[in-house]
């Protein structure tokens, strides 16, 4: 995993700049791990960043991600009167100028260097789940979540009508 010292040097001014035309309501610097306590790590390989899901060695420092929170209206056709309510969306940035990005065609999660304003593919609806977990749903593809597949992050379609175990789309956020 590469050093994420750049994240620690983020300033409020940097992220108060217009990203989607609005400022984030808050930000949170956290390590990201799976439901089974594997760490999400980021490595620079051949001038591009790779994302891994791995067990860290004891005392190995966890990579950090900056979560920027935004309010958003749920894009639901069910309720034009807004009764579905506002929800929270996040962008995730492990190092300066790079954001997690949903590649819906490849069903993959990638790190892209993005210009502001950030594309919709960089935004995820944040789901508050039990067991101190969250899930990240693609803004661009409702029902598709960031999940773990073969020790990598991938996009996973979750159908609420199916009886499937969703531990692979549950993540823990930790300040340590």
């Amino acid at each position: 995993a590469f050093g994420i010292s750049g994240v620690q040097k983020y300033t409020r001014a940097l992220h108060d700049s217009s990203i989607t035309g609005i400022s984030p309501i808050t930000e949170y610097l956290a390590s990201l791990s799976t439901y089974n306590d594997q760490s999400i790590t980021f490595a620079l390989e051949d001038e591009s960043y790779e994302i891994y899901v791995e067990d860290l060695k004891k005392d190995e420092k966890k990579d950090k991600v900056l979560l920027s929170y935004y309010e958003s209206q749920h894009p639901s056709n069910e309720s034009g009167d807004g009764v579905d309510g506002k929800m929270l969306m996040v962008t995730l940035s492990p190092t300066k100028d790079f954001w997690l990005h949903a590649n819906n065609k490849e069903h993959s999660v990638e790190l892209h260097k993005c210009e502001k304003p950030l594309p919709d593919q960089a935004f995820f609806v944040l789901h508050n789940m039990h067991s101190n977990c969250v899930s990240f749903e693609c803004k661009t593809d409702p029902g598709v979540f960031i999940g773990v597949k073969d020790n990598h992050l991938a996009l996973i379609k979750v159908d609420s009508s199916e009886n499937l175990c969703t531990e692979n789309i549950l993540f823990k956020l930790s300040e340590t």
Partner: antibody
Framework: EVQLVESGGGLVQPGGSLRLSCAAS????????MNWVRQAPGKGLEWMAE??????????HYAESVKGRFTISRDNSKNTVYLQMNSLRAEDTAVYYC????????????WGQGTLVTVSS | DIVMTQSPDSLAVSLGERATINCRAS??????????LNWYQQKPGQPPKLLIF???SQGSGVPDRFSGSGSGTDFTLTISSLQAEDVAVYYC?????????FGQGTKVEIK
């Protein structure tokens, strides 16, 4: 129009049972966590129970005061959530509201009008 | 359980004046970098209505005169200019931990 309509309330003797129903319409019911919240006459709000989705294994959670006596369940084919109340006590007398959490599960944003349950001999 | 305590229990404010309601949690309701603190308004004979979520974000369709602030254990709901239709009971609620708990409510009346 998004709507929750409760039914099944009424007068019941202490120790008795009652089943409340909540019929949902105007939204994709199977996508939302559902709750029951009650309010004793002239008192404040008290959260009772919650049921999640099929892909969360329909996990349920209860307030301590009703654990073991009340059971929340749902039937997605009927767009209905239920609250089975057993071993009722006088202190369970209240208006019972069916409530839906928002998409993403951050807060309750749809409420029914409530149904009154009176436990008295 | 997290105990939520509101103050004052009741409040009489002149039309157009500011109303402030406080809510204190027995332990922090912060998680994931946000405060799991919601505010609801309940008018007589009606179910509650969401005003504020995650401490400071307005619910859909909520007038701008309602605002929320705070983090950790101490929170405030402010009505910047009280209107006649704001007469109601206001509740804070934490949704960080089960059981979700409400404050005892604050009754707002016109002076």
């Amino acid at each position: 129009e998004v709507q929750l309509v409760e039914s099944g309330g009424g007068l019941v003797q202490p120790g008795g049972s009652l089943r409340l129903s909540c019929a949902a319409s105007g939204f994709t019911f199977s996508n939302y966590w559902m709750n029951w919240v009650r309010q004793a006459p002239g008192k404040g709000l008290e959260w009772m129970a919650e049921i999640t989705l099929k892909f969360n294994n329909y996990s349920t959670h209860y307030a301590e005061s009703v654990k073991g006596r009340f059971t929340i369940s749902r039937d997605n084919s009927k767009n209905t959530v239920y609250l089975q109340m057993n071993s009722l006590r006088a202190e369970d007398t209240a208006v019972y509201y069916c409530a839906r959490r928002n998409y993403g599960n951050w807060y309750i944003n749809v409420w029914g009008q409530g149904t009154l349950v009176t436990v008295s001999s | 359980d997290i105990v939520m305590t509101q103050s004052p229990d009741s409040l009489a404010v002149s039309l157009g004046e500011r109303a402030t309601i406080n809510c204190r949690a027995s332990e922090s309701v912060d998680k994931f970098g946000v405060s799991f603190l919601n505010w609801y308004q309940q008018k007589p004979g009606q179910p509650p209505k969401l005003l504020i979520f995650v401490a400071s974000s307005q619910g859909s369709g909520v007038p701008d005169r309602f605002s929320g602030s705070g983090s950790g254990t101490d929170f405030t709901l402010t009505i910047s200019s009280l209107q006649a239709e704001d007469v109601a009971v206001y509740y804070c609620q934490q949704s960080k931990d089960i059981p979700y708990t409400f404050g005892q409510g604050t009754k707002v009346e016109i002076k």
